[in-house]
């Protein structure tokens, strides 16, 4: 059946549309296109005679139509009036007619909208605000966005006027946000610039800080007042009801008992016209001076500088005390006190020496503490760490690397790829990576204060396919019943399954075997000699499955209790004594002999020719394994009889 397909169906003004003909019959004489749903000579657009390949414009031809030999009609530079139905009239060679109708709709390209507001500075809990999306456009849909999110459900939010108007009733400070409107029709969508709602609120009840109300004579009084307010509040201070100053902070140096009293902070919002006050009562006590700490070096460098901390003021016949981390001084060769205990010297500071440090002056009744002092020890950078630890990434994912090096002041970071500088940031982000992003990724950490730099290099491979894995071990020669061994399957890759086999079999169930790190690490706790087997790991991802070469665990064990052979203990005089000692051990043990406690030779076999009764005694074999650090021994008694006295005794060998 002859059909017309409009491509596209919804057309933007100024664009073009193709009326595509399907199932055009064969053996045609010609065809004509008409505007509308029927054949009407007054509304003919164009006709086409196949024999002459001649196209003839009709009354409705606008100059923007092109007819193709396959009968399809292209209309260019579309205008609103073009909306509607189009009819194709086909005349076959047998002069039988066939018709088909198609249609399309024309929509304007929307302009960028803007937001108008009926209230630019609404007051919290009082005003409403109506945002209107301009301009008003026919056949357009209106949408609203708050902080780039769709509108939350709230009884205070109301859409009206075909969603063109957004009203916020009873605004609150939380309504301070970015508002955008969007207009949509079937051919376009446009979003406005954001409008920030500026809600006037406050002041809330002010907060006076610090909270402490007790001070010593001679201290500075520094009170700060803050009240949440928009626009920011104007502050006034009153002491015992008397106006002092219009500032946010009240500072009175070197206070005395006379400064005790009630301190009032008043916050005023000129736009809302509201005032709020808070009162605090300050008490000043008369006491001896509070000690304080001075330092000869405020920014010492780790492992380089010494720091001398002195407790001030210097007072005769006074006992000085020191605390580090709220504890009394630890015993350390790097901590030295002067004769009067007033100066504490830290030799060759480390990053762990930051403190806090406090000194105290002891008087008759109590101990006065100084304020704590924290040392700013400059150190690092240490070797940077690049995370995550993956070395393999699949194409198409995002690569996000972060670098961190312990450093004070914090390190400045640079990234290089294959030696070429990329950027001076702590994080490196590359989206949608390909195999061309494989390479050497270097993070350089620099400490501007010390001038020191350290680098770490990581090889990144971008490949869907994983390489043949390998096994790394944290202990190549574990000791039996003592050590644990952690095997790790390399490389570490995203979206990868890790598997393990022992002697070609899947892992046995054992409380001494533990998988961790996404099955990438196999840990054997308390290894035994029976664990000396072939371990293989496998990796699998979307396109690969691969096994490592086997790694055989070399478990060090022994020496076990040795065995002396032959087992005979009685010999005839004149026989040869040939004793052999053996102990299960890895590596092979060192052997030594003692006869009646006297060291003999360091051999596995002890040979004595033509023994006599003088050779009676205790024969001890000692075994030692230098690798395990373990020793063992066994003692055997040998009796030698004069020949002929004891028949049936061994003649030796």
């Amino acid at each position: 059946k002859l059909t017309i397909e409009s491509t596209p169906f919804n057309v933007a003004e100024g664009k073009e549309v193709l009326l595509l003909v399907h199932n055009l019959p064969q053996h045609l004489f010609g065809y004509s296109w008409y505007k509308g749903e029927r054949v009407d000579g007054n509304r003919q657009i164009i006709g086409y005679v196949i024999g002459t390949q001649q196209a003839t414009p009709g009354p409705a031809y606008s100059g923007r139509e092109i007819i193709y030999p396959n009968a399809s009609l292209l209309i260019q530079n579309i205008i609103q009036n073009d909306t509607g139905f189009y009819t194709l009239h086909v005349i076959k060679s047998d002069l039988v007619n066939e018709e088909a109708t198609g249609q399309f709709r024309v929509y304007p390209e929307l302009p960028k909208p803007s937001i108008s507001s009926n209230n630019s500075k609404p007051v919290e809990d009082k005003d409403a605000v109506a945002f209107t999306c301009e301009p008003e456009t026919q056949d357009a849909t209106y949408l609203w966005w708050v902080n780039n999110q769709s509108l939350p459900v709230s009884p205070r939010l109301q859409l009206s006027n075909g969603n063109r108007t957004l009203t916020l009733f009873n605004v609150t400070r939380n309504d301070t946000a970015s508002y955008k409107c969007e207009t949509q029709n079937p051919v376009s969508a446009r979003r406005s610039d954001s409008v920030i709602l500026n809600v006037l609120y406050g002041p809330d009840a002010p907060t006076i800080s610090p909270l402490n109300t007790s001070y010593r004579s001679g201290e500075n009084l520094n009170l700060s007042c803050h009240a949440a307010s928009n626009p920011p509040a104007q502050y006034s201070w009153f002491v015992n009801g008397t106006f002092q100053q219009s500032t946010q902070e009240l500072f009175i140096p070197n206070i005395t008992v006379n400064n005790s009293g009630s301190y009032t902070c008043q916050a005023h919002n000129s736009d809302t016209g509201l005032n709020r006050t808070t009162v605090t009562t300050i008490t000043v006590y008369a006491e001896p001076p509070k000690p304080f700490i001075t330092s000869n070096n405020s920014n010492p460098v780790e492992d380089e500088d010494a720091v001398a901390l002195t407790c001030e003021p210097e007072i005769q016949n006074t006992t000085y005390l020191w605390w580090v981390n709220n504890q009394s001084l630890p015993v350390s060769p790097r901590l030295q006190l002067s004769n009067d205990n007033r100066t504490l010297t830290l030799l060759s500071v480390t990053r762990n020496d930051v403190g806090p440090y406090e000194c105290g002056i002891q008087n008759e009744l109590s101990v006065d503490h100084s304020d704590p002092v924290i040392l700013n020890v400059l150190y690092g950078p240490d070797d940077p760490t690049i995370s995550p630890s993956y070395t393999y990434y699949r194409p198409g994912v995002n690569l996000s690397l972060s670098c961190h090096a312990a450093s004070n002041p914090p390190a400045q970071y640079s990234w290089l790829i294959d030696g070429n500088i990329q950027q001076h940031t702590q994080e490196l982000f590359i989206s949608n990576i390909t195999e061309k992003n494989s390479g050497l990724y270097t993070c350089q950490a620099n400490n501007s204060a010390s001038g020191h730099s350290r680098t770490t290099v990581k090889t990144i491979t971008v490949s869907a396919e994983l390489p043949k894995p390998s096994i790394s071990s944290n202990n190549s020669k574990p000791v039996e019943d003592k050590d644990a061994v952690a095997f790790t399957c390399e490389p570490e890759a995203q979206n990868t399954t890790y598997l393990w086999w022992v002697n070609g079999q899947s892992l046995p169930v054992s409380p001494r075997l533990q998988l961790s790190n996404g099955n990438r690490t196999l840990t054997l706790f308390n290894v035994t000699r029976n664990d000396a087997r072939a371990y293989v790991c496998g990796i699998q991802n979307s396109v690969s499955a691969n096994r490592s070469d086997p790694v055989t665990l070399d478990v060090l064990y022994g020496p076990d209790t040795p065995i002396i052979s032959p087992p005979d203990s009685s010999y005839l005089s004149g026989a040869n004594l040939n004793l052999s000692c053996h102990s299960a051990s890895n590596p092979s043990p060192q052997y030594s002999w003692r006869i009646n406690g006297i060291p003999q030779q360091h051999t596995q076999v002890l040979f004595i020719a033509k023994i006599t009764p003088n050779n009676n005694g205790t024969y001890a074999c000692f075994v030692s394994n230098l690798a395990t650090g373990r020793n063992n021994s066994i003692v055997k008694s040998i009796t030698v009889s004069a020949s002929g006295t004891s028949p049936g005794l061994s003649a030796g060998a």
Partner: antibody, heavy 120, light 106 residues
Framework: EVQLQQSGPGLVRPSQTLSLTCTAS????????MHWVRQPPGRGLEWIAW????????EYAPKFRGRATMLADSSKNQASLRLSSVTAADTAVYYC?????????????WGQGTLVTVSS | DIQMTQSPSSLSASVGDRVTITCSAS?????MHWYQQKPGKAPKLWIY???NLASGVPSRFSGSGSGTDYTFTISSLQPEDIATYYC?????????FGQGTKLEIK
């Protein structure tokens, strides 16, 4: 025994959507990636896509992106392929395929193949 | 996309002959994999990760190569080896196959 059994119509009309299902037995599809590969008559092999049934992650060949959809139903141990707006050029034998560890060995399994003809 | 060029596209050899098929990738790949396909059957993985024989594959088959150039070899052709062989790369998406080499007996 590991098996992949394919099902789906052998004839699809142009512009329609081709739908094929691959039912696995002998292993759990959640633990493996399922692939689809096709082979037009007398031609070579062409990879379409894979899916990770555990989380629904997919990767498509650019040529099929936007037209192919891979889905998995772990409860039925099934993976499926939908290819929309087909034309005669989509006539091919379609295979589902999985690469798994069977014991100690990495094994490659394929469905029996489904010849899909696109014709009106 | 990585293009895979297999040569020859077909070859005729006698039983006992040494047969070599080459596969060239347009960019460097990690490994090459080879499939055997007999008429009307699904492909079978024959050699994986360049040189490893899949389960049940006779030792007369071997694979080698690196980077962009890879080789598939049958040391002594047997009648049951008659099939079409495809190379495949899995290093980057989309995964791509060679156009195939059809092996026939003279």
């Amino acid at each position: 025994e590991v098996q992949l059994q394919q099902s789906g119509p052998g004839l699809v009309r142009p512009s329609q959507t081709l739908s094929l299902t691959c039912t696995a037995s002998g292993f759990n599809i959640k633990d493996n990636y399922m692939h689809w590969v096709r082979q037009p008559p007398g031609r070579g092999l062409e990879w379409i896509a894979w899916i990770d049934p555990e989380n629904g992650d997919t990767e498509y060949a650019p040529k099929f992106r936007g037209r192919a959809t891979m889905l998995a139903d772990s409860s039925k141990n099934q993976a499926s392929l939908r290819l929309s707006s087909v034309t005669a050029a989509d006539t091919a034998v379609y295979y589902c395929h999985v690469l798994i560890y069977a014991g100690y060995l990495a094994m490659d399994y394929w469905g029996q193949g489904t010849l899909v003809t696109v014709s009106s | 996309d990585i293009q895979m060029t297999q040569s020859p596209s077909s070859l005729s050899a006698s039983v006992g002959d040494r047969v070599t098929i080459t596969c060239s990738a347009s960019s460097s790949v990690t490994y090459m994999h080879w499939y055997q396909q007999k008429p009307g059957k699904a492909p079978k993985l024959w050699i994986y990760s360049t040189s490893n024989l899949a389960s049940g594959v006779p030792s007369r088959f071997s694979g080698s190569g690196s980077g962009t150039d890879y080789t598939f070899t049958i040391s002594s052709l047997q009648p049951e080896d008659i099939a079409t062989y495809y190379c495949q790369q899995r290093s980057t998406y989309p995964l791509t196959f060679g156009q195939g080499t059809k092996l026939e007996i003279k």
